[in-house]
Every structure is written in structure tokens, then in C-alpha cells.
Amino acid sequence: EPCVEVVPNITYQCMELNFYKIPDNLPFSTKNLDLSFNPLRHLGSYSFFSFPELQVLDLSRCEIQTIEDGAYQSLSHLSTLILTGNPIQSLALGAFSGLSSLQKLVAVETNLASLENFPIGHLKTLKELNVAHNLIQSFKLPEYFSNLTNLEHLDLSSNKIQSIYCTDLRVLHQMPLLNLSLDLSLNPMNFIQPGAFKEIRLHKLTLRNNFDSLNVMKTCIQGLAGLEVHRLVLGEFRNEGNLEKFDKSALEGLCNLTIEEFRLAYLDYYLDDIIDLFNCLTNVSSFSLVSVTIERVKDFSYNFGWQHLELVNCKFGQFPTLKLKSLKRLTFTSNKGGNAFSEVDLPSLEFLDLSRNGLSFKGCCSQSDFGTTSLKYLDLSFNGVITMSSNFLGLEQLEHLDFQHSNLKQMSEFSVFLSLRNLIYLDISHTHTRVAFNGIFNGLSSLEVLKMAGNSFQENFLPDIFTELRNLTFLDLSQCQLEQLSPTAFNSLSSLQVLNMSHNNFFSLDTFPYKCLNSLQVLDYSLNHIMTSKKQELQHFPSSLAFLNLTQNDFACTCEHQSFLQWIKDQRQLLVEVERMECATPSDKQGMPVLSLNITCQMNK
Amino acid sequence: QKQYWVCNSSDASISYTYCDKMQYPISINVNPCIELKRSKGLLHIFYIPRRDLKQLYFNLYITVNTMNLPKRKEVICRGSDDDYSFCRALKGETVNTTISFSFKGIKFSKGKYKCVVEAISGSPEEMLFCLEFVILHQPNSN
């Protein structure tokens, strides 16, 4: 069975084809080759000589037991080599010779028992080494690591490392890898020698499900003393053994580390006193809790020095009390409990993401809701009922506003966005908005992107609501049940490049409303009910138009519409997916491609 | 279509068939077997995925006595610092995991429950597997 050609001459998928040897019938130009799940078993030298241009090679689960000297010799362009799930028993010292451009080596679940005799010391270009899910017992980083000066990611998770000693990291003192991210999760740790991490600098350290008791956790974290880490991730996994007890003593040792960003990811335990618990983390710049349950929500009003707070997928009794002077970014998403938003006091806040919480807002939105006048980014998407009771007074700095899939109330009672002269992006898609007031978008003089799909208009008519949006480049009006539009609806949109009118109820096409759209490049009218043109004589669309989508409409392929069908043929160079433009009537022509019709009308006259 | 039996409990019998053409082997054990009136137990899965499990989610199509419920999307792996350790599993890596579950206070009417589980993962998104579970429910007391 042949390999699947994914990208001609470049990418080939030969997965699970029962190959016992490497195929030689693929082009020399092959750059990406997936040979996974084939019983190759043995790689002799120069095994891939037929692929001189290869950049990515996937040999996952190929039952490889032996890799000879120079197996990959000649692959000087290879950047990624994946060996996951091979039961390697014999790995020659020169197994990886010739890989002068290798950046990513994945040797997950390959029976690797030690880093010491893993022959990779010459791979100077290596950026990522993944040796997770192996049998490694010692964390001693061999001397050859001093050659791996580009290493950025080392994944040692799911190994058998129990202890870390001062000598294990000696090589890092000789060559401070300022950018190294280290994952030690799921190793059964019980001892970290104090001083082992002294004066070590890491970009990221991940320790999840490493400790089987609170005491072990406490002493191991104390053993990290002296470490300078940009991002520290602690926590557990839901499907692994969890700590039975967790209290403030667990994290006391963090006072002896220098941490820029901290994250606690999943804890099967109720956090009831976060002030004491995170006492050593009051001055990290970014603080993050993922999948934890928080009992006392008042604690977030303590004077933490965080600039970025992230609360994701957590459980709260009620919406937390947030009073944080220095906070610039707040991400509060996909949380449960506390369904009603309550005011926060965050005077420095610039970025606020409150999406996917099922929250309801009794009144939205003004400075008093968020306690800031600096807000530039506000995401309230995928929430509950949001009642518009103020037009963003004190929030004039906003540049990005997203309400999609929330239920907006009172949108047509006043000019909701009047203050937002700096707003660039607005998404009110699928918000149950019914446009019944022409001043709905007044004030949005800087707006470039407007998404309002899935809403509705009074009498299914699009009025002149865009008159002030002179900088608009993208407009989505799809799924709005529109049947008609004002001939001057788009007259002020001279910068508009993309207009989506798909999935509406238009029965005819008219070029007149688009005459002022001098920058229009994409017009999508797919999934309407277009049968014919509004007027007999259709003019040309703006000369800038490059893509016109008229697919899945109800074209009437009869003589009375001959001029319209001819006009469509004349637009051929603009049309996309022409094979999906089919006749709907008459019944004998149903399903026929519109462009293949030979329209001669004598016989039917 | 070959049917794979999972388990029987006092009020339910659970089995599954594959609904994709690849039919990559997957081993599923539930201990103790699910009782629909209330249940607490462990789900054990042994599987070698044909693609990375990063950004794994399930599309669930549930049918109750021939009545179709709306499609549900259950995100399992978001992509970074996920709740489950198997979210970091790579294509070809053995996934051998036990997940605890519990639910209570749901009253099910007697009949045949079908649940098509479409597992989607990776970037670009592709189907990982598709299983159709059949639960025959015979409540002791309705």
C-alpha cells in the first residue's frame, strides 16, 4: 500500500502500512516523513540516505530495538526526530551522528535508563529533548550537557527520579542555560539536597505529582532554595495519586526562591486561607491558579503585588472580592460558582478576560464596575445575561471588546458604545441583539473589526447604522436573517476589505450598495436564497474585489434570468468554489453547476 | 460490527462498538460497574494513541430510546498545564490510566441509551477514535 502524499513532493504519511523496510519510492525532495507504527525493528547505518532533504522524521512505535552507528548519517537538514514508543535495546555510540541541524529529539518511552550513556553530546543545535516516560533514576546531568548550549526544553517527567543531589546540576553552574525549561513532573521524589539548586537559573520548572505526602513536599521545596526561576508550576493531576493533606507549611520554602511567575495547577484540596498559603508569593509578577477550589474569596483583596492574576477552571463559592492595586491583567475564565459579577477594584487594570463563566451582569459597563480607567481589553464572551445600563463611562481607553455568545439586553435603547472612540475590535456575535436603533454604533470612529453574526434586525432590514465607522476593515453580518438592506448602508465604509453577508435570507443580488467600497477584497454571499439580480442590469463590483462567494444559493437557471446568469459567468475570475454554485430551479436543471450551463434561450421562447 | 462488553451492574449492562474504520485497540474497564441510580468507581483505560493527545476533546451524541439529545462537547485537555496527566501523551506513547468518577441523584427511565464518543485531538484537529456505547438500563425500582 502506498504512502499518502499530504503535500506533493514534501510530506508523506506512511503510518501503519506494515513496512519492514524504509520505502525508497518517495521523492528525494521529501521533507516530512511519517513512518510511525511500522515494524522496522532495526535501523542500519545510512538508513535514510534516500531522503537528503528530510527535516521531520516520525518513527513512533516502529518496534525499533537496534539503532546502528550512523543510522541517520546524511540527514544534515533534519530538525525533528521522533522515536516515541520504541523498545530500544541497543543504541550505538554514533547512533545520532550526522544530525548537524537537529533541534528536537523525542525519545519518550524508549527504555532509556540513564542520560549518562545517551549519545547526544555532539548535538549542539538541540533545543528540545524529551525523554519522558522512561526508566531514568538519576537526575545527574552528564558533562556533555555543556555542549548543548541551545537547549531550551528538557522533559524528564514520568521517570524514576527519587533524589536530587548538589552534584547532579554541576554542569549548569559551568554553563548557565538562561532559557532552560525543566519538567520533572510524575517522578517519585522524596529528597532534594539543600543547595542543589543554589544559584541555578531556569526559565521554567514544573513539579506536578512529585510528592506523596505534605512533609515530603515541604522538605523538597525547601531543597529548591537559591533557585532563580522565571516560571514555577506546582500541582497535581486529577488522575494520579493526590496529597491527602495540604496547608500553608507546604509552600513556606518558596520564600527562599526568586520567582517571577507562579502557577498552581490542579489540587484536589480546598484552599481556605490563601493569604497565609501564598505568603511567599506576594511579590511575584504573575500568579495563576488552575483547577483549584477556593473557599474564602475575600482573600483576593489582600495587598498582593501581582501584576497578572489568572484564575482558570476554578470553583468559587461566590464571585471573588478583588482589590489589587498593582494588577494590570486579570484572566478569570471557565470558572464555576459565583454566577453574579460583583464590582472589583483594580485601579491599574488594562486587560480583563472574564469569558466562559456563565456570569450575569446586572449593569454594564462603566469604570465603577472594574475600578479602573486604564482598561484596554475586555472579554465578556460566553457568559449569561449582560444588561447594558451605561455606555462605558470612564472606560474610554478600550481597544478590544468581546461579548460573543453572551445575552445582551437593552442594546437598542441608547448609544451603548458612544464613549469608545479608541475601540478597534468589537464582537457582539450571537448575543440575541435585535437592532432597532440606528445609533447603535455611534461613537466608534476608530473601529476596524465588527463581528455581529447571529443577531437580528427590525423587519429583517439593514439600515444605515455604520455611518460613523469610517475605519472599518472587517464586517461580519452572517446569520442575521437579513432580507433587505438600505442602498446606502455601506456608503461610509471606504476602508472595508472583508464583508460577510452569508447565511441570510437575500433572494436577489444587487451591486449598487457596494459602489463606495473602494477597498473591498472579499464579499461572501454564500448560503442565501439568491435566485436572480435585483435589477436587470447589474453593475460591476468595486475593482478591488478579489473573492466573491455565491455558493449554496438558489439560482434560477431559466431564460428570464439569462442576463444574470451571464453576469455571473463574467465574474468567473472572482468566484470561489464555483463547483458549489448550482441551479435550484427548474427541476430538470437542479444540481447542475451554474457556470457549465450553456444558456441558449431560443427553444424556450 | 463486533461488540465489546464492558460490564454488568445491578441496573445496567454496558458494551461498545467502534464507529470509525480504523478501530485502533482500546481497553476499557469500569470497577465497580456503573449503576445508573448512583455510582462511584474507577475507569481504567489502556490505549496507544495514533496522534498526540494535546487539546483532546469529546463530541458526545446521546440517544435515549431513539430520541437524540443535542451534541455535547467536553473539553478534556486545554493544551497547557492540564488536569489529566495523559494530556501530555504523545502519538505512540502508552496511555495506561485510571480516572475516578462519581455521580448521584440522577433518575433514568428504563430503556436503551446510546452514546457516540468522538475523540478529537491535535493540531490540526483530527479524529482519534470513535466508540459507540450502548447502556441497557433496567432499574430495579423506577
Epitope: 523496510k21 525508497d24 519510492n25 542500519g44 547505518s45 545510512y46 538508513s47 540516505f49 534516500s50 552507528d69 | -
Partner: nanobody
Amino acid sequence: EVQLVKSGGGLVQAGESLRLSCVASGISISTEVMGWYRQAPGKQGESVAIIKTDGSTYYPDSVKGRFAISRDNAKNTVYLQMNSLKLEDTGVYYCVIPGRGPGQGTQVTVSS
């Protein structure tokens, strides 16, 4: 056991030509991809010519138009014709059958 015996290396001047040949024993080359790989001192090794069973060939840009690979299945031999040799063509040239490795190298030295 597969053996590859090479001949034709030596010292030549820039601009001159040289022909390398490689005779295989213990295997029939008619079903094998064959090629030449070179290793210059202090430089990254590279494949300089490959020929498949159907006669299709590959050359990197560095030798394209100057080198030509050919095979004689009857003689179980593969050849490398090297024309307009440059100083940077100096190195040890190996005859290769994928998965079976190279034979002994043959030294080619191009002098000015």
C-alpha cells in the same frame, strides 16, 4: 556479508576530472538505492549523489552539473564521474547502500 570496494580516488588539480567506482559483493545492487557521501575535514558531511533502481538521481546544488552518478547492475557497480573539480570537493568519499552502510572511504584531494 555485504562488502563495498572502491577505487579511483587520488590527487588532482582544480578543474580536472576523476571517476570513482564501487563494486558490491554479497548483494545484488539491482534492487538497491546507491550513492556517494563525502566527509571533508572540519566540515559537515553531505550526500553528493544518489541513484535509485529506476535510474532517478539526486545531486545537491554544490555539485549539480559537475558530478554524474551511474550504475551498471550487471557488473554490480556504481560510478561517480566528477568533472570541473574544485578545492572544496576535497574529502573522503564513501559508497553507500542505505541501511547497509558505507564501505571504506576513498580520499579525493583537489589542489590548486
